[in-house]
C-alpha cells in the first residue's frame, strides 16, 4: 500500500470511498474554480489515502462528466492531490447534478467492491441544471440510497440548487447539506466538513 | 520561453502607493504575482486568468492591492494602496502555462521573473 506520512494533526483513517463531484459551470469563475480545488487538495491531505484506508475519487461535471482520479487508482498520496489541482477549467453553460448522479451510481459505484467501507458523494454545485436534465434526479438519489452511498450537498454562492440540495437531504438522515455564500466560505467549513464524513466511516477492525 | 520582467518597485511612505508592471514576452495562461520578504519564504499575492478575467487576492493584501492585465501588451500590474512596511518585499511575477498545483503554491507557476524590490518606510 503506497502510504505517506501525515501533514496535519487532524488524519482520517477509516474505511471510506469518497468521491469528490466538482461543478464546471461558468456559475464559478475560473478564480472560484481555482478555490473549490484548493479545497479539494485541502480534504485530501487531511484523509488517510490508500488502496486499504480511504480511496478518492475526483470526477468535474458539466453537461456530462469527466473522472481525473478514480477509486482503484494505485498512486501516492501527494499525486493525486497533484492530479486534483489540475483538473480544468471547463467554465460551461450548464452542469448537470443529475447526469453526475446517474455517473456515480453506475460508473463510481457499479460493483461494490468494499463492503465494510463508507460511500460518500461529496456533491460541489454552485448552479441550476436546467428543468429537462432533471426529471430523473431524485431516481438517481434513490439509487445511490439504495446502494449505501451517502450524498452530501455543498452548495456555494446564490446559484446553487437549493430546491435539490433539499431533496437529496430528505431521502437520508446522513445526507446532509452545507450552504455556502460563496467560495471563500470553503475553507472555514473544511474541518467540518471532514471531521462529519469522517465520522460517518468505520474503523478499521483490529487484527486478528 | 516565457519572459517575464517586473519593474515599478521603489522606496515608499506608509500609506502611500505603487504600482507593480511585469511585461511577459509570450502567451502566458495565468499571471500572479508573489513576495518574499526578508528572512522569510515566497508568498503568494494575487492571480488573474486568462479565460475570464477573474481574480484571487491573499487575504492580506484584500482591499489593498489589485491584480490586473493588458492581454493586448502582454502586461499584468499590481495596483497596491495603503502601503504598511510588512508589504516590504521583493515582487516577484510568475506565469502557468498548465493547471498542476494549487493557484497559491509555487510550484504552480513555469515562469519567473527577476523581482523588484518594495520598502515601505514607517
Known amino acids: 500500500d503506497i502510504s505517506e506520512p501525515p501533514l496535519h494533526d487532524f488524519y482520517c483513517s477509516r474505511l471510506l470511498d469518497l468521491v469528490f463531484l466538482l461543478d464546471g459551470s461558468s456559475r464559478l469563475s475560473e478564480a472560484e474554480f481555482e478555490v473549490l480545488k484548493a479545497f479539494v487538495v485541502d480534504m485530501m491531505e487531511r484523509l488517510r489515502i490508500s488502496q486499504k484506508w480511504v480511496r478518492v475519487a475526483v470526477v468535474e461535471y458539466h453537461d456530462g462528466s469527466h473522472a481525473y482520479i478514480g477509486l482503484k487508482d494505485r498512486k501516492r498520496p501527494s499525486e493525486l492531490r497533484r492530479i486534483a489541482s489540475q483538473v480544468k477549467y471547463a467554465g460551461s453553460q450548464v452542469a448537470s447534478t443529475s447526469e453526475v448522479l446517474k455517473y456515480t451510481l453506475f460508473q463510481i459505484f457499479s460493483k461494490i467492491d468494499r463492503p465494510e467501507a463508507s460511500r460518500i458523494a461529496l456533491l460541489l454545485m454552485a448552479s441550476q441544471e436546467p428543468q429537462r436534465m432533471s426529471r430523473n434526479f431524485v431516481r438517481y438519489v434513490q439509487g445511490l440510497k439504495k446502494k449505501k452511498v451517502i450524498v452530501i450537498p455543498v452548495g456555494i454562492g446564490p446559484h446553487a440548487n437549493l430546491k435539490q440540495i433539499r431533496l437529496i437531504e430528505k431521502q437520508a438522515p446522513e445526507n446532509k447539506a452545507f450552504v455556502l455564500s460563496s467560495v471563500d466560505e470553503l475553507e472555514q467549513q473544511r474541518d467540518e466538513i471532514v471531521s462529519y464524513l469522517c465520522d460517518l466511516a468505520p474503523e478499521a477492525p483490529p487484527p486478528t | 520561453q516565457v519572459q517575464l520582467v517586473e519593474s515599478g518597485g521603489g522606496l515608499v511612505q506608509a500609506g502611500g502607493s505603487l504600482r507593480l508592471s511585469c511585461a511577459a514576452s509570450g502567451r502566458t495562461k495565468d499571471m500572479a504575482w508573489f513576495r518574499q520578504p526578508p528572512g522569510k519564504e515566497r508568498e503568494f499575492v494575487a492571480v488573474i486568468y486568462s479565460s475570464d478575467g477573474s481574480t484571487l487576492v491573499a487575504a492580506s493584501v484584500t482591499g489593498r492591492f489589485t491584480i490586473s492585465r493588458d492581454n493586448a501588451k502582454n502586461m499584468v500590474y499590481l495596483q497596491m494602496t495603503s502601503l504598511k512596511p510588512a508589504d516590504t518585499a521583493v515582487y516577484y511575477c510568475?506565469?502557468?502555462?498548465?493547471?498542476?498545483?494549487?493557484?497559491?503554491?509555487?510550484?504552480?507557476?513555469?515562469?519567473w521573473g527577476q523581482g523588484t524590490q518594495v520598502t515601505v518606510s514607517s
Open positions: 510568475a506565469s502557468s502555462r498548465g493547471y498542476s498545483g494549487t493557484y497559491y503554491s509555487t510550484s504552480r507557476y513555469d515562469y
